[in-house]
C-alpha cells in the first residue's frame, strides 16, 4: 500500500491492504477505497471493463468471472490496485478464445486462472498431441500464457491451457492459433508477356501476377515517366495459408500510338520491393518487312541444289504466302514457319528448296506474303551455271569454219591447229568473227556464242580444235584436214 508523503498527492489506500485476494465462489467480495478525493473503481479482466463510482465495491455472491484486477483512482489520477481470484473448482480458467499471433512476435493465450495455488500451469496440444518442440511459453496466472516468438508453423495449432488442481489435470476450452506471416522476401512478380505490338484501336490488356505470403502485399501498375493513375482490375487466390496470388490486369480498351511505352508492375511488402516491365508498341497500321537470308542474285551449277531463304516480320499475322516462278505457283518444295514459338513472335521464315536445277530453270523466283493490312514481295534472280555445249561446228561455203557454243556464264571459244594427226593442239588461231547471238534475248538461261575462222590459212594436213569453255567446264570439237594436191579434199568435223 502507498506511503503518504505530506505536501504531494498520494495514491488511494485499499482495504484489505493486500496486492492479491483469494475469495471462494459464492462468497462476498468487499473492497474499500480510502481517499478523500475518491473518483472511481475500475474492474478489468480479459477485454471486459466495469466501473463503479461508490468507494466501496461489493459483490455479494462472487463468481469465477469476478476474478480480475480492481483499481481505485482518485481525483489526481493516482491509483492503487488489488487482484482478486474467485476460486471456483468448476471453472479454473477464464478464456478469450481468440488467439492471433504475428510471426516472430510473442502472443498471449488469454486463459487467466481463478485459483493461483494450482500447479503446472502450462500449454498442452489438443487430443493429446504434443506441442511443437520449439514452442516456448511463459505462464502468468493473472494474464494467461505467452507464446514466445510465434512461428509460421504454429498456424492452425490447437491447444489448451492446462493446470493441476488437487492432483488432477484440468484443461481449458481449446484455442486455435492463427498466425499472420512476416514478410521474409520480396514479392514474386511476373507478367503475362514482356512485349505487346498492337494496331491503333485494338485493346491492350496485360496481367501481372504477384505472389506473396499474405494479401497485405501492395501492388500497382505504373507507366514509366508518368504519374497518371492506371485503371486496373484485381483477382486473387489463397492457394494455401501462406501462398497468396494476386492478378492485377491493366487494360487500355482502345490503344493509341501515344500509349506506346514501358509499363511497370510494382509490388512491395515490409521486406522490400520488386517490379517487372512490359513494353507496348502501338502502330497506326500493320506491316511486313522482308529480309533475304541469301543474296538475291544466285548462281548455281547445273544439277546442284539451292535453297532460297527469307525471313520476314509480319504484323498482324501473315495470311497468304506463295513462291512463284514464270507465273506458276509452287505447291510444294517450300515451307513457311514462325521463327520462334513465342506468343508475341512476329518473325517468320520461308524456304524454297530447288533441287537438281537444269540450265533451263534459271529465272526470277518471287516470294509474296500478305496480311490483313499490307502485302510485300521479294525476287531472287537465279542463274544456272552450265558447261558449254557445242551446238554446231561446220565448214561454210565461203571456206570459213564456224563453231556455235551455248552455256552460262557466256562461253569463250578458242581455236587451235594441230599438224598431222595429233590431238593435242597448241598453236592458237585467231578467230575472224565472234558474236554473242542471244545477248538481247531472255535474261536467264544459256548464252550462245558463234566464232569463225578462215580455213584457207591452213596449208598442211592436220586437225583444227574449236574449244568452248567457261567457269563450269570445257567442250571441244575437231575438224580434220587432208590435202590432195592443192585441194583440201576432206574436212571431217568430230567432237
Amino acid at each position: 500500500q502507498p506511503s503518504v508523503s505530506p505536501g504531494e498527492p498520494s495514491p488511494p489506500s485499499i482495504h484489505p491492504a493486500k496486492s492479491e485476494l483469494i475469495v471462494r465462489v459464492g462468497n462476498e467480495i468487499r473492497l474499500l477505497c480510502i481517499d478523500p478525493g475518491f473518483v472511481k473503481w475500475t474492474f478489468e479482466i480479459l477485454d471486459e471493463t466495469n466501473e463503479n463510482k461508490q468507494n466501496e465495491w461489493i459483490t455479494e455472491k462472487a463468481e469465477a468471472t469476478n476474478t480480475g484486477k480492481y483499481t481505485c483512482t482518485n481525483k489526481h489520477g493516482l491509483s492503487s490496485s488489488i487482484y482478486v481470484f474467485v476460486r471456483d473448482p468448476a471453472k479454473l480458467f477464464l478464456v478469450d478464445r481468440s488467439l492471433y499471433g504475428k510471426e516472430d512476435n510473442d502472443t498471449l493465450v488469454r486463459c487467466p486462472l481463478t485459483d493461483p495455488e494450482v500447479t503446472s500451469y502450462s500449454l498442452k496440444g489438443c487430443q493429446g498431441k504434443p506441442l511443437p518442440k520449439d514452442l516456448r511459453f511463459v505462464p502468468d496466472p493473472k494474464a494467461g500464457i505467452t507464446i514466445k516468438s510465434v512461428k509460421r508453423a504454429y498456424h492452425r495449432l490447437c491447444l489448451h491451457c492446462s493446470a493441476d488442481q488437487e492432483g488432477k489435470s484440468v484443461l481449458s476450452d481449446k484455442f486455435i492459433l492463427k498466425v499472420r506471416p512476416a514478410f521474409k522476401a520480396v514479392p514474386v512478380v511476373s507478367v503475362s508477356k514482356a512485349s505487346y505490338l498492337l494496331r491503333e484501336g485494338e485493346e491492350f490488356t496485360v496481367t501481372c501476377t504477384i505472389k506473396d505470403v499474405s494479401s497485405s502485399v501492395y501492388s500497382t501498375w505504373k507507366r514509366e515517366n508518368s504519374q497518371t493513375k492506371l485503371q486496373e482490375k484485381y483477382n486473387s487466390w489463397h492457394h494455401g495459408d501462406f501462398n497468396y496470388e494476386r492478378q492485377a490486369t491493366l487494360t487500355i480498351s482502345s490503344a493509341r500510338v501515344n500509349d506506346s511505352g514501358v509499363f511497370m508492375c510494382y509490388a512491395n511488402n515490409t521486406f522490400g520491393s520488386a517490379n517487372v516491365t512490359t513494353t507496348l508498341e502501338v502502330v497506326d497500321k500493320g506491316f511486313i518487312n522482308i529480309f533475304p537470308m541469301i543474296n538475291t542474285t544466285v548462281f548455281v551449277n547445273d544439277g546442284e541444289n539451292v535453297d532460297l531463304i527469307v525471313e520476314y516480320e509480319a504484323f498482324p499475322k501473315p495470311e497468304h504466302q506463295q513462291w512463284i516462278y514464270m507465273n506458276r505457283t509452287f505447291t510444294d518444295k517450300w515451307e513457311d514457319y514462325p521463327k520462334s514459338e513465342n506468343e508475341s513472335n512476329i518473325r517468320y521464315v520461308s524456304e524454297l528448296h530447288l533441287t537438281r536445277l537444269k540450265g533451263t530453270e534459271g529465272g526470277t523466283y518471287t516470294f509474296l506474303v500478305s496480311n490483313s493490312d499490307v502485302n510485300a514481295s521479294i525476287a531472287f534472280n537465279v542463274y544456272v551455271n552450265t558447261k558449254p555445249e557445242i551446238l554446231t561446228y561446220d565448214r561454210l561455203v565461203n571456206g570459213m569454219l564456224q563453231c556455235v557454243a551455248a552455256g552460262f556464264p557466256e562461253p569463250t571459244i578458242d581455236w587451235y591447229f594441230c599438224p598431222g594427226t595429233e590431238q593435242r593442239c597448241s598453236a592458237s588461231v585467231l578467230p575472224v568473227d565472234v558474236q554473242t547471238l542471244n545477248a538481247s534475248g531472255p535474261p536467264f538461261g544459256k548464252l550462245v556464242v558463234q566464232s569463225s575462222i578462215d580455213s584457207s590459212a591452213f596449208k598442211h594436213n592436220g586437225t583444227v580444235e574449236c574449244k568452248a569453255y567457261n567457269d563450269v567446264g570445257k567442250t571441244s570439237a575437231y575438224f580434220n584436214f587432208a590435202f590432195k594436191g592443192n585441194n583440201k579434199e576432206q574436212i571431217h568435223p568430230h567432237t
Epitope: R156, K178, V179, R180, S215, S216, Y218, T220, S236, W237
Partner: antibody, heavy 120, light 108 residues
Framework: EVQLLESGGGLVQPGGSLRLSCAAS????????MSWVRQAPGKGLEWVSA????????YYADSVKGRFTISRDNSKNTLYLQMNSLRAEDTAVYYC?????????????WGQGTLVTVSS | EIVLTQSPGTLSLSPGKRATLSCRAS???????LAWYQQKPGQPPKLLIY???TRESGVPDRFSGSGSGTDFTLTISSLQAEDVAVYYC?????????FGGGTKVEIK
C-alpha cells in the same frame, strides 16, 4: 469491443451518386482488410468490394466494376464506398465487414448496415 | 467465379432435431476456405464456422461443419428456438468472394 458503424445511405435517383462511410473502433484498423457486402430487400448476401489493409489491393464484383470505388483512411479509421451511376438494382442494405486477423475475405465482424434506395 | 448452391432453400424442423444444411461449389474450394454465417432477422450476419469445420469463438458446439473440395455441410445437432435464422456459406479462396443463396431454418 469491435464496432463498425456505417453511414451515408439514403434515397437517390437512378444515375445519382452516394458515398458510404464505415467508422471503425475497438481494433487497430490499419492492420485489417475491409469489405463492403450488400443485401437487397428479402434477398441473400452479395459481396461488393474489398480493400487490403495497406490499400494495396482493391477488388470489385463485376456488377459494380467501373461505378463503385472503395477507399480507406487509416488515420481516420474509416472505410469508404463511392457509388456512382447508381441503378435500381443497387438498392440494398450495405454492410461493412472486417477481415479476420490472418486471412482476407473471411469476416469476423459486421456493421449494422445502411440502407441505400435507388428510385425515381 | 465460384458459384455456391445451398440446399434446401428452407428447412422446417422440430426443436431438438438434427438440421443438415448443404453447400455445393461449382469448382473446388482449395484448402477448405469455406465459411458459414448465421443471419437473424434485422441483424447483420455472424461468423459461425471457418476452414469448413472450425467453430468461431463463442459459437455453441451444437454447430459443426464438414466437407472439402466441392461439397460442404453445416450441421446443427439439436435445433434450438434461437437457431431460427438464414444460414449462408461463403468461399474466401478466390475473388470475387461469393456467398450461397442461403438456407432458411425455421421451427416446425
Amino acid at each position: 469491443e469491435v464496432q463498425l458503424l456505417e453511414s451515408g445511405g439514403g434515397l437517390v435517383q437512378p444515375g445519382g451518386s452516394l458515398r458510404l462511410s464505415c467508422a471503425a473502433s475497438g481494433f487497430t484498423f490499419s492492420d485489417y482488410g475491409m469489405s463492403w457486402v450488400r443485401q437487397a430487400p428479402g434477398k441473400g448476401l452479395e459481396w461488393v468490394s474489398a480493400i487490403g489493409y495497406g490499400g494495396g489491393g482493391k477488388y470489385y464484383a463485376d456488377s459494380v466494376k467501373g461505378r463503385f470505388t472503395i477507399s480507406r483512411d487509416n488515420s481516420k479509421n474509416t472505410l469508404y464506398l463511392q457509388m456512382n451511376s447508381l441503378r435500381a438494382e443497387d438498392t440494398a442494405v450495405y454492410y461493412c465487414a472486417k477481415d479476420t486477423w490472418w486471412l482476407a475475405g473471411l469476416f469476423d465482424y459486421w456493421g449494422q448496415g445502411t440502407l441505400v434506395t435507388v428510385s425515381s | 467465379e465460384i458459384v455456391l448452391t445451398q440446399s434446401p432453400g428452407t428447412l422446417s424442423l422440430s426443436p431438438g432435431k438434427r438440421a443438415t444444411l448443404s453447400c455445393r461449389a461449382s469448382q473446388s474450394v482449395s484448402n477448405s476456405y469455406l465459411a458459414w454465417y448465421q443471419q437473424k432477422p434485422g441483424q447483420p450476419p455472424k461468423l459461425l464456422i471457418y476452414w469448413a469445420s472450425t467453430r468461431e469463438s463463442g459459437v455453441p458446439d451444437r454447430f459443426s461443419g464438414s466437407g472439402s473440395g466441392t461439397d460442404f455441410t453445416l450441421t446443427i445437432s439439436s435445433l434450438q428456438a434461437e437457431d431460427v435464422a438464414v444460414y449462408y456459406c461463403q468461399q474466401y479462396y478466390s475473388t470475387p468472394l461469393t456467398f450461397g443463396g442461403g438456407t432458411k431454418v425455421e421451427i416446425k
